[in-house]
Amino acid sequence: AQNITARIGEPLVLKCKGAPKKPPQRLEWKLNTGRTEAWKVLSPQGGGPWDSVARVLPNGSLFLPAVGIQDEGIFRCQAMNRNGKETKSNYRVRVYQIPGKPEIVDSASELTAGVPNKVGTCVSEGSYPAGTLSWHLDGKPLVPNEKGVSVKEQTRRHPETGLFTLQSELMVTPARGGDPRPTFSCSFSPGLPRHRALRTAPIQPRVWEPVPLEEVQLVVEPEGGAVAPGGTVTLTCEVPAQPSPQIHWMKDGVPLPLPPSPVLILPEIGPQDQGTYSCVATHSSHGPQESRAVSISIIEPGEEGPTAGSVGGSGLGTLA
């Protein structure tokens, strides 16, 4: 069978080889398509409900005024010339529709290096057959499931037209120290050969490099956190990050109801101030970061200060 590719909605003429150019003709077209269950016979004298789909022209050719998805299939013509010689024509018709230019929607303007990010969703509407979407980084194809690249795909079919809508969501994990302005694009490749790919306009998100977090240091005075009754303890939270984060204080795992401050002073220590203290630094670009915990305890006269804590009460300190 001769392969014929026709665009949906366009007319198509199939020649009946060996047919006399004018009536009377002895010819018969048979079609087996999405509109038939077996073979449908169309003859030159036939005219009827099938004319909207296919009709035999005076020269014996079969005319399809507007090819549709249901017209995919086999078309055969059997003709006899004036001398009684029989000729058969056999066509396999496949149809296609090129979608509109694909688009990237919900695109990110900024990506964070070292963590997975959604770059955007590529959408192609109105294709047949479905075809495929692929992503490119700086013009080179991105391979899903390689080097922190993942793609989530979805294909939907329009209930009336039968045309396809494709969606492809790209997630990437940019390498630290990589390109600060990578160029992403997406392209649609048709399901039928000999049709070039359609590419989206590129997007260029910025890649933000998070500064590696240095540890939050908690310095206690006196060292070791053991103090005589009535003494003073100063806790200082040191965070190297710029700009300076907000510092909150915790005692025994519970936030202290105090305004943010990098220094906590516990004057005139009493039994209620004993416990485990830590500070929490909250950065605008990161989550909260907690320091190590230190134990504050009271030494009775003649006792040596312990370095590990005892359970304390609920007294509040003073902020510097």
Epitope: G47, G48, P49, W50, S52, V53
Partner: antibody, heavy 119, light 107 residues
Framework: EVQLVESGGGLVQPGGSLRLSCAAS????????MTWVRQAPGKGLEWVAS????????YYPDSVKDRFTISRDNAKNSLYLQMNSLRAEDTAVYYC????????????WGQGTLVTVSS | DIQMTQSPSSLSASVGDRVTITCRAS??????VNWFQQKPGKAPRRLIY???NLADGVPSRFSGSRSGTDFTLTISSLQPEDFATYYC?????????FGGGTKVEIK
């Protein structure tokens, strides 16, 4: 909403003529074949004529061929049936319907218009 | 020309009954058969298209089936508003041919 409204029916003498109209709205008229169907009093449905979406091709049963002519004006979203040489057996309610080909077949109908052929 | 032989021409049934109407085509018409409902003084309304597909807005108690050149309309549980006349139509070839109709009456 698809709407088809017939008009032009009435009483006519045998051998006379009548022109029926069907005004279409609520859909892209020139995308569809159109058809006339009739129903004699107390009887079943009978196909009368069909026309393709361009108006280039028309189809009739033997019972009305050469007497009836179906036509359309796509600019006016209108379908017509010119009936000549009318006979008593043409007395019926005439319906216009959308479709008539294998793609869309009579999915919407007008309310009908009565044609009476009598002396 | 294709003949569409519809049976029965009339039937009496009660609300809740299952009703079956058949049309036999005199030659192969593929899937190109519709079913219509008509009430007195009203235009026909399409119920089933291309043998088995339920038209928009038609209750699911109506269904269509096909076996070769035999086409069946089934009403699974007859409702008071279903008492009407039903017609089949073949639209595979001209002349388009309707069945003779089946009048469904209250028993």
């Amino acid at each position: 909403e698809v709407q088809l409204v017939e008009s032009g029916g009435g009483l006519v003498q045998p051998g006379g003529s009548l022109r029926l109209s069907c005004a279409a709205s609520g859909f892209t008229f020139n995308n569809y074949w159109m058809t006339w169907v009739r129903q004699a009093p107390g009887k079943g449905l009978e196909w009368v004529a069909s026309i393709d979406n361009s108006g280039d091709n028309t189809y009739y049963p033997d019972s009305v061929k050469d007497r009836f002519t179906i036509s359309r004006d796509n600019a006016k979203n209108s379908l017509y049936l010119q009936m000549n040489s009318l006979r008593a057996e043409d007395t019926a309610v005439y319906y216009c319907a959308r479709g008539g080909d294998i793609k869309v077949s009579l999915d919407h109908w007008g309310q009908g218009t009565l044609v009476t052929v009598s002396s | 020309d294709i003949q569409m032989t519809q049976s029965p021409s009339s039937l009496s049934a009660s609300v809740g009954d299952r009703v079956t109407i058949t049309c036999r085509a005199s030659q192969d018409v593929g899937i190109y058969v519709n079913w219509f409902q008509q009430k007195p003084g009203k235009a026909p309304r399409r119920l089933i298209y291309r043998a088995t597909n339920l038209a928009d807005g038609v209750p699911s108690r109506f269904s269509g089936s096909r076996s070769g050149t035999d086409f069946t309309l089934t009403i699974s549980s007859l409702q008071p508003e279903d008492f009407a006349t039903y017609y089949c139509l073949e639209f595979d070839e001209h002349p388009l041919t309707f069945g003779g109709g089946t009048k469904v009456e209250i028993k």
